[in-house]
């Protein structure tokens, strides 16, 4: 058991151009609060999936009112840590979502209104009992700076909070196979419940139900001494009881390797062999690598697959963030000029241009009617600089040179027959249909053919995510 702790340091505009507008105003004062959601392992990032490791809401921050004309500063934050207690072992690898919520304190009917300002997500490796890890994440134009750690609740210790501690029985050192409880050096790790009958003197276990033997002893319950030659050690005085040498202090005593690293002695000191995702002299540094598949939404991972290599994600269009976890509203940058309509298709941006403009961003002003002639009595119409002919009846095409057959496009629906007429076209409808284009079914009872409107949707609030 233990607690995941999150400390928010700042929430404000990120670096670069396009500083965000302040979320609060004199007319609408507001305050911030944060929500954290934790999931074990490298799990799905969907915000709606359950927070299997736990979730927490912060207190509300101080009320903030924007100073007119001033850029959005770092916003005032709630006091204290966000704490997510976990009952079982700490998984070591986890996914997080941190949401910044705004509570508007205007004259809303029915109490304050909540809206989500920013959401950041990521996946990290973290050993319990380690130091605070610092992080910076960006969501659009906002930047969130925070630190986090996982700590075990006594009597649990270890990188996964699965080992237990108890007060020392002897003043000098812990019993066989047991280590001091860092940072509680006056306590020792309590033995786990080993296999029934496992020798308390010569056996120990790292998992419940197992029985591993100390040097010099063997057998399923570590009760059989091996020959004394095999338990000779290059150091330490002889023990009268076992005939074996009891090790004296060495560089690997107390295991200086963190996060499950294994220690081996070298001629001068020691060397730690670290598990994947940890590195450093004592395996104290944690890092997710490309081998963990950390990039979302089809992003490509760049950086080594080996643990001492950091990674970055190359994000596809429309996504950003350190893990490509944030969708970009690219139309908010108003890329279409001259009043063009912006369409974000996911894989690309498209601009639908107003008449008279063209180009990928509607940047080209088309020629007007100057020097253009419309045939067959058509007249040139100026429309935002575009050349367009309004054709006389019976003619069509860009320059009114084509004789128009109004029935060519089969305009009559539901089997209606089309007749060309001097004023355009006429549809003779099949039985049961009516309208200028035979588009409406005739209902004998006069009931409407229109579908019912969908029911209204209730707006969400932060509680429904918890």
């Amino acid at each position: 058991a233990g607690v995941f702790e999150l400390q928010i340091h700042s929430f404000g505009p990120g670096p670069g151009p396009g500083a965000p507008r302040s979320p609060c105003s004199a007319r609408l004062p507001c305050r911030l609060f944060f929500r954290v959601c934790l999931k074990p392992g490298l799990s799905e990032e969907a915000a709606e999936s359950p927070c299997a490791l736990g979730a927490a809401l912060s207190a509300r921050g101080p009320v903030y009112t924007e100073q007119p004309g001033a850029p959005a500063p770092d916003l005032p934050l709630p006091d204290g840590l966000l704490q997510v207690p976990f009952r079982d072992a700490w998984p070591g690898t986890f996914s997080f979502i941190i949401e910044t919520w705004r509570e508007e304190l205007g004259d809303q009917i029915g109490g304050p209104a909540w809206s989500l300002l920013a959401r950041v997500a990521g996946r990290r490796r973290l050993a319990a009992g380690g130091p605070w890890a610092r992080d910076i994440q960006r969501a659009g134009a906002w930047e969130l700076r925070f630190s986090y750690r996982a700590r075990c609740e006594p009597p649990a210790v270890g990188t996964a909070c699965t080992r237990l501690c108890r007060p020392r029985s002897a003043p000098s050192r812990c019993g066989p196979g047991l280590r001091p409880c860092a940072p509680l050096e006056d306590e020792c790790e309590a033995p786990l419940v080993c296999r029934a009958g496992c020798s308390p003197e010569h056996g120990f276990c790292e998992q419940p139900g197992e029985c591993r033997c100390l040097e010099g002893w063997t057998g399923p319950l570590c009760t059989v001494p091996v020959s004394t030659s095999s338990c000779l050690s290059p150091r330490g005085p002889s023990s009268a009881t076992t005939g074996c040498l009891v090790p004296g202090p060495g560089p690997c005593d107390g295991n200086p390797c963190a996060n499950g690293g294994s220690c081996s002695e070298t001629p001068r000191s020691f060397e730690c062999t670290c598990p994947r995702g940890f590195y450093g002299l004592r395996c104290e540094v944690s890092g997710v690598t490309c081998a963990d598949g950390p990039c979302f939404n089809g992003g490509l991972c760049v950086g080594g697959a080996d643990p001492d290599s950091a990674y970055i994600c190359h994000c596809p269009p429309g996504f950003q963030g350190s893990n490509c976890e944030k969708r970009v509203d690219r139309c908010s940058l108003q890329p279409c000029r001259n009043g063009g309509l912006c369409l974000d298709l996911g894989h690309a941006l498209r601009c639908r241009c107003r008449a008279g403009f063209a180009g990928p961003r509607c940047e080209h002003d088309l020629d007007d009617c100057a020097g253009r002639a419309c045939a067959n009595g058509g007249t040139c119409v100026e429309g935002g600089g575009a050349h367009r002919c309004s054709c006389a009846l019976g003619f069509g095409g860009r320059d009114c040179r084509e004789r128009a057959d109004p029935c060519a496009a089969r305009p009559c629906a539901h089997g209606g027959r089309c007749y060309a007429h001097f004023s355009g076209l006429v549809c003779a409808c099949a039985p049961g249909y009516m309208g200028a284009r035979c588009e409406f079914p005739v209902h004998p009872d006069g009931a409407s053919a229109l579908p019912a409107a969908p029911p209204g949707l209730r707006p969400g609030d932060p509680q429904r995510y918890l």
């Epitope: 392992g41 490298l42 799990s43 799905e44 990032e45 996946r123 490309c290 081998a291 598949g293 979302f296 939404n297 089809g298 992003g299 490509l300 991972c301 760049v302 697959a305 190359h314 596809p316 269009p317 894989h347 690309a348 941006l349 990928p360």
Partner: antibody, heavy 119, light 111 residues
Framework: DVQLQESGPGLVKPSQSLSLTCSVT?????????WNWIRQFPGNKLEWMGY???????NYDPSLKNRISITRDTSKNQFFLKLNSVTAEDTATYYC????????????WGQGTSVTVSS | DIVMSQSPSSLAVSAGEKVTMSCRSS????????????LAWYQQKPGQPPKVLIY???TRESGVPDRFTGSGSGTDFTLTISSVQAEDLAVYYC????????FGTGTKLEI
């Protein structure tokens, strides 16, 4: 329809640099995708060399990292491969290929250009 | 680096027969977050560049005949051609895109 066309010298001397151009038509290289160089050795072995993304980010095969560079000219809708200090082992057919982010698949390949490294 | 191996290196079959070829990776290509295996199969006919047949281990590229089927997960993958046609004469490559991109050694199909 997207078309990719490789061009460059067919013969390069050892220790010199190999430079190839991929000309793309039918799609802007700044709109989407990652634009790769892949080579196929005489024994048919395929090797991914690196890519440049629509926004200009690059990623290279670690074994080539010290001598490869992929750049682009967006005004000409072209991207380029430069491989330094070539040896006879770099003799291969070089393909420019675009890859799709969503599927991580090499969607469309050029016809390839054969390069021989020999003195 | 992820290493990809294919077997057999070549096989000769008659038209209409069923063919299976295998691809093995040195580490799992399954991403537990996206629930996808990042493995693709390519077909390279003589004198042509490779062409994608299957992606995500089992999803057929549009326009690819349904006699081509991909299967497998983790480290072991299979490409099956249910009834070989003369035009299927080609070399077939698997490729991983879980981390960077690595191609298999290829399986040459002779009719």
């Amino acid at each position: 329809d997207v078309q990719l066309q490789e061009s460059g010298p067919g013969l390069v001397k050892p220790s010199q640099s190999l430079s190839l151009t991929c000309s793309v038509t039918g799609y802007s290289i700044t709109s989407d995708f990652y634009w790769n160089w892949i080579r196929q050795f005489p024994g048919n072995k395929l090797e991914w060399m690196g890519y440049i993304t629509y926004d200009g980010s690059t990623n290279y095969d670690p074994s080539l990292k010290n001598r490869i560079s992929i750049t682009r000219d967006t005004s000409k809708n072209q991207f380029f491969l430069k491989l330094n200090s070539v040896t006879a082992e770099d003799t291969a057919t070089y393909y420019c290929v675009y890859g799709d982010f969503n599927r991580h698949a090499m969607d469309y390949w050029g016809q390839g250009t054969s390069v021989t490294v020999s003195s | 680096d992820i290493v990809m191996s294919q077997s057999p290196s070549s096989l000769a079959v008659s038209a209409g027969e069923k063919v299976t070829m295998s691809c093995r990776s040195s580490q799992s290509l399954f991403n537990s977050r996206t629930r996808k295996n990042y493995l693709a199969w390519y077909q390279q006919k003589p004198g042509q560049p490779p062409k994608v047949l299957i992606y995500w281990a089992s999803t057929r590229e549009s326009g690819v005949p349904d006699r081509f089927t991909g299967s497998g997960s983790g480290t072991d993958f299979t490409l099956t051609i249910s009834s070989v046609q003369a035009e299927d004469l080609a070399v077939y490559y698997c490729e991983q895109s879980f981390y960077l991109f690595t191609f298999g050694t290829g399986t040459k199909l002779e009719i």
